[in-house]
């Protein structure tokens, strides 16, 4: 009896794993083995496919074959017993085009109200993605274990932190990779679950801001309690895309180690030009807070986007505010040759209710004030360029008293 060729050969490529699956064409014939040959583009001869010779099952793995993943190859299969079937040729394919991105590896770290997610490619030093390793982006689905309501987060990098979670709550998530340059979407990782911790008695520092004073950076933050020590760490922002890089390590700012105030001052030359992430942690000697939310810090912009200086002319029912160029060390004005928008915040000195005005002009009227009342004003500048969406820190507050009634003219 003539052996029939196997049919329906499927090639599955996930990362560097090459798997072949096929159907037996005749289930009634026992003790049949199967063998594959392959042929590279531009070659006439067929070569035995190692790992896929004399296979008794209907699946084989040819991952050990060192192929050029961008080169088209052709496969053929036949069945063998005493005699052999005719060859069945599989449509030619390019491994890279056919390959799927495998499930990434995921490591989770729990805080009380946040989860840190570390993601790395499932296949280390993959041949398939050797040229694209740094182009991976990831997306994830996260849900509270108790509710199952899913939230999707797209376009994240190898390290991502999800904030505003509840303490002592189990969250589950799964992650998949994408190579947008090749229109490839990967396979989801297994589901990983982690329980957030009990609430930390020490909250993380908040409202971190960087400003420039003389030749120094001044880093300020808010904290709930007194008598604390703080440490500040920095990281090159580009490394968030590539934690596999051995440079990926948060480092101490020496002048901001164990500081006892809610600010620290360090020389501008600590940082070369670039974009950095900064984070702050508090300690009371016994306990330590979790890390603050990270802020992005661009030395180029920080150096030139200083808070505005302004003068106030007080009337009975309004202030006229005249905004000037910020002053550098030595009291010389900074020339800023790019358009700015000004955010002016004012409030009655005896109240916390703030009002806001946003203006492009450098002379601004603050209307509807009460006579003989002390008002405080602070201002900051924003760049109007979409690509350069940056803000200065707020200027120091200036407080003035409005004039008695009927002086508005």
């Amino acid at each position: 009896k003539n052996l029939k060729s196997p049919q329906k050969v499927e090639v599955d490529i996930i990362d560097d794993n090459f798997i072949l699956r096929w159907n037996r064409s005749d289930e009634s014939v026992g003790n049949v083995t199967f063998s594959f040959d392959y042929q590279k583009t531009g070659m006439d001869n067929w070569i035995k496919l190692s790992g896929c010779q004399n296979i008794t099952s209907t699946k084989c793995n040819f991952s050990s074959l060192k192929l050029n993943v961008y080169e088209e190859i052709k496969l053929r299969i036949r069945a063998e017993k005493e005699n052999t079937s005719s060859w069945y040729e599989v449509d030619s394919f390019t491994p890279f085009r056919k390959a799927q991105i495998g499930p990434p590896e995921v490591h989770l770290e729990a805080e009380d109200k946040a989860i840190v997610i570390h993601i790395s490619p499932g296949t280390k030093d993959s041949v398939m993605w050797a040229l694209d390793g740094l182009s991976f982006t990831y997306s994830l689905v996260i849900w509270k274990n108790s509710s199952g309501v899913e939230e999707r987060i797209e376009n994240i990098y190898s390290r991502h932190k999800i904030y505003k979670l509840s303490p002592e709550t189990t969250y589950c998530l799964k992650v998949k990779a994408a190579l947008l340059t090749s229109w490839k979407i990967g396979v989801y990782s297994p589901v990983h679950c982690i329980k957030t911790t009990v609430e930390n008695e020490l909250p993380p520092p908040e409202n971190i801001e960087v400003s420039v004073q003389n030749q120094n950076y001044v880093l300020k933050w808010d904290y709930t309690y007194a008598n604390m020590t703080f440490q500040v760490q920095w990281l090159h922002a580009f490394l968030k895309r590539n934690p596999g890089n051995h440079l990926y390590k948060w480092k101490q700012i020496p002048d901001c180690e164990n500081v006892k105030t809610t600010q620290c001052v360090f020389p501008q030359n600590v940082f070369q030009k670039g974009i950095y992430l900064l984070r702050v942690q508090a300690s009371d000697g016994n306990n330590t807070s979790f890390w603050s939310e990270e802020i992005k810090f661009d030395t180029e912009i920080q150096a030139f986007l200083l808070p505005p200086v302004f003068n106030i002319r007080s009337l009975s029912d309004s202030f006229h505010i005249y905004i000037g160029a910020p002053k550098q060390s030595g009291n010389t004005p900074v020339i800023q040759d790019y358009p700015l928008i000004y955010e002016i915040i004012f409030w009655e000195n005896t109240s916390n209710a703030e009002r806001k005005i946003i203006e492009k002009k450098t002379d601004v009227t603050v209307p509807n004030l009460k006579p003989l009342t002390v008002y405080c004003v602070k201002a900051r500048a924003h760049t109007m360029d979409e690509k350069l969406n940056k803000s200065s820190v707020f200027s120091d507050a200036v407080c003035e008293k409005t004039k008695p009634g009927n002086t508005s003219k």
């Epitope: 490591h107 770290e109 729990a110 805080e111 009380d112 840190v116 570390h118 390290r159 982690i194 329980k195 911790t197 009990v198 930390n200 008695e201 934690p243 596999g244 051995h246 440079l247 990926y248 390590k249 948060w250 016994n286 306990n287 330590t288 979790f290 890390w291």
Partner: antibody, heavy 123, light 107 residues
């Protein structure tokens, strides 16, 4: 697979120094902290310190800070722990143990351990 | 330094028994707790990290629970190879500290 192989047993006199090595293989050496832990005969475990093999940053248990030196040889993926001014109470098995990834935000458990090096201090 | 107090310090049990070992920290350690098993003349072996996460290759009869300052290692059905000394360790604050150990012996 991950392996940490330590140097052999040492006998030292009080006041001397000992240098124990730990050769790592099976993972990216510079991506993980390397810790040192000791265990006196019949006693519990005591953390000595840790080193980042990529840049040699170290953290120590204050108890050992003045007497211990941790160093790295990246070319051979080896970490060294040197303990000076030895006294009889330093007689212990010294272990190297891999810690968390350096890129993690927080410290991690010690997932792989060397086989241990017995250091005996005796006059 | 954070103190880790393990109890009991020794325990006799039989194959098939359910065994619980507890570990208390002097400060909150936010689930940064590991459990290790050590057999005579051998290095410790990591069983559980993050208070509850079972390391790969560790039998599912081992489980960890707890939060804040109180943590527990449970062995649901003791096997002959489980007789050993068990240590807890906190890695929230440096210096990392270990419990004094619990010796699990055959009854």
């Amino acid at each position: 697979q991950v392996q940490l192989v330590q140097s052999g047993a040492e006998v030292k006199k009080p006041g001397a120094s000992v240098k124990v090595s730990c050769k790592a293989s099976g993972y990216t050496f510079t991506s993980y902290w390397m810790n040192w832990v000791r265990q006196a005969p019949g006693q519990g475990l005591e953390w000595i310190g840790k080193i980042d093999p990529s840049d040699s940053e170290t953290h120590f248990n204050q108890k050992f800070r003045d007497r211990v030196t941790l160093t790295v040889d990246k070319s051979t993926s080896t970490v060294y722990m040197e303990l000076s001014s030895l006294r009889s109470e330093d007689t212990a098995v010294y272990y190297c143990a891999r810690g968390g990834r350096i890129s993690f935000d927080y410290d991690a458990a010690l997932d792989y351990w060397g086989q241990g090096t017995l250091v005996t201090v005796s006059s | 330094d954070i103190q880790m107090t393990q109890s009991p310090s020794s325990l006799s049990a039989s194959v098939g028994d359910r065994v619980t070992i507890t570990c208390k920290s002097s400060e909150v350690i936010y689930n940064r707790l590991a459990w290790y098993q050590q057999k005579p003349g051998k290095a410790p072996k990591l069983l559980i990290s993050g208070a509850t996460t079972l390391e790969s290759g560790v039998p599912s009869r081992f489980s960890g629970s707890g939060s804040g300052k109180d943590y527990t290692l449970t062995i649901s059905s003791l096997q002959p190879e489980d007789f050993a000394t068990y240590y807890c360790q906190q890695y929230w604050n440096k210096p990392f500290t270990f419990g004094q150990g619990t010796k699990l012996e055959i009854k």
